[in-house]
């Protein structure tokens, strides 16, 4: 969490950021709140992005003020108009690219003072993992699959009754290029895997980590997958 | 050659549903938004919804929030769109759109679209 | 939402003539202004991008032009086969609106 205050003249406001990550070709959500003023006509939001020349984003007297944007945010960006009033000035962008990492800045103009804050932005891809059957194999086998991941994952193996155990042995992952040519499928196989068990299949990077699990008895199959952004810290 | 088919038009009574698909082919499906945009019988025309290249981002206009559910299957190369409690206005020739690759919020592929009745 | 606006809704041309139809946004959105063709039984085709950006496999004689709320698609010298209908679109926001279009016909 960002706290930034505001400095000169006028007095201060607090602007408040979250460190987010966003998910290449989905849209993403840069968090950004501030004191709320009564009337919408005097709130100036701009976005800034370090490195680049033009604005991310301006909205001005209730509407979008888009001449000063740069090149590579044009058609992209958008704030939720009928809650700037209430001091949300919070960015929706709109199909993230790997390219739109980095450090922005919110900053706010009220009538009761100035404010901004920084905001880390991370892009990848990430995606939640099913684990199924591989009936195809010789031996009682688990698949696990996601279709999107960058920067490359681990994947490691973990089971209920075997905690701790190393599955390494008898596991086997393949990352394919998917056809943008950035993201990646994961598939990891595992080998020998016993009934009456539940096993996990986690894969990891330094944006996302997601667990897909798997509990195979006689009867029946249960699954579960669940995925977290790591790192995401307010400002 | 990019081609765009929709299917699964028809007549539907007021507080209907239905749901329309558009088979995508000649271009990587998984690298690019969609879109619906209507055309009604006065030739006006309405964007719909959007869906992301890979599914889990989707808008909507005010017109159709809560009714209508755009959705696609990459697996499939196809887009969907399930309309549902319909109204006569939604009454419109419906066309699935490629949206421009990266920016712009713009339409460079259009299907040749499939006709929606809303009528008693 | 922008409300674009174009004039005029009809415009009979001859061969030959260079037209300009017009597109208003209720508010500025920059170069954000696409247009589109639609011919009779057709679907409409992306003619112009970016206000002024040029289409591969449109011809030349289509060109686009304005910025902030004006913006014009000029058609140099009209051909039998330009008649039909021609929409701007607002890429400026992501509630994409469309004007109510032109009709192009021949006297």
């Known amino acids: 969490l960002i706290i930034g205050f505001g400095i000169s003249g006028r007095h201060s406001i607090t602007v408040t950021t979250v460190a987010s990550a966003g998910n290449i070709g989905e849209d993403g959500i840069l968090s950004c709140t501030f004191e709320p003023d009564i009337k919408l006509s005097d709130i100036v939001i701009q976005w800034l992005k370090e490195g680049v020349l033009g604005l991310v984003h301006e909205f001005k007297e209730g509407k979008d003020e888009l001449s000063e944007q740069d090149e590579m945010f044009r058609g992209r960006t958008a704030v939720f108009a009928d809650q700037v009033i209430v001091g949300n000035a919070s960015l929706r962008l709109k199909n993230v690219q790997l390219t739109d990492a980095g450090t922005y800045k919110c900053y706010i103009i009220t009538s009761k003072g100035k404010g901004n804050a920084n905001l880390e932005y991370k892009t990848g891809a990430f995606s939640m993992p099913e684990v199924n059957v591989d009936y195809n194999a010789s031996s009682e086998t688990l698949r696990c699959e996601a279709p999107r991941w960058f920067p490359q994952p681990t994947v490691v193996w973990a089971s209920q009754v075997d905690q701790g155990a190393n599955f390494s042995e008898v596991s086997n992952t393949s990352f394919e290029l998917n056809s943008e040519n950035v993201t990646m499928k994961v598939v990891s196989v595992l080998y020998n895997v016993t009934i009456n068990n539940t096993y996990s299949c986690m894969i990891e990077n330094d944006i996302a980590k997601a667990t897909g699990d798997i509990k195979v008895t006689e009867s029946e199959i249960k699954r579960r997958s669940h995925l977290q952004l790591l790192n995401s810290k307010a400002s | 050659e990019v081609q765009l088919v929709e299917s699964g038009g028809g007549l539907v009574q007021p507080g209907g549903s239905l749901k329309l698909s558009c088979a995508a082919s000649g271009f990587t499906f998984s690298n690019y938004y969609m879109s619906w945009v209507r055309q009604t019988p006065e030739k006006r025309l309405e964007w719909v919804a959007y869906?992301?290249?890979?599914?889990?981002?989707?808008y909507y206009s005010d017109s159709v929030k809560g009714r209508f559910t755009i959705s696609r299957d990459n697996a499939k190369n196809t887009l969907y769109l399930q309309m549902s409690s319909l109204k006569p206005e939604d009454t419109a020739m419906y066309y699935c759109t490629r949206e421009s690759y990266s920016q712009g919020n713009y339409f460079d592929y259009w299907g040749q679209g499939t006709t929606l009745t809303v009528s008693s | 939402d922008i409300v674009m606006t174009q004039s005029p809704a009809t415009l009979s041309v001859t061969p030959g003539d260079r037209v300009s139809l017009s597109c208003r946004a209720s508010?500025?959105?920059?170069?954000?202004l696409h247009w589109y063709q639609q011919k009779s039984h057709e679907s409409p085709r992306l003619l112009i991008k970016f206000a002024s950006q040029s289409i591969s496999g449109i011809p030349s004689r289509f060109s686009g032009s304005g910025s902030g709320s004006d913006f014009t698609l000029s058609i140099n010298s009209v051909e039998p086969e330009d008649v039909g209908v021609y929409y701007c679109q607002n890429g400026h926001s992501f509630s994409l609106t469309f004007g109510a279009g032109t009709k192009l016909e021949l006297k």
């Open positions: 508010q500025s959105i920059s170069d954000y």
């Open positions: 869906v992301s290249s890979g599914g889990g981002s989707t």
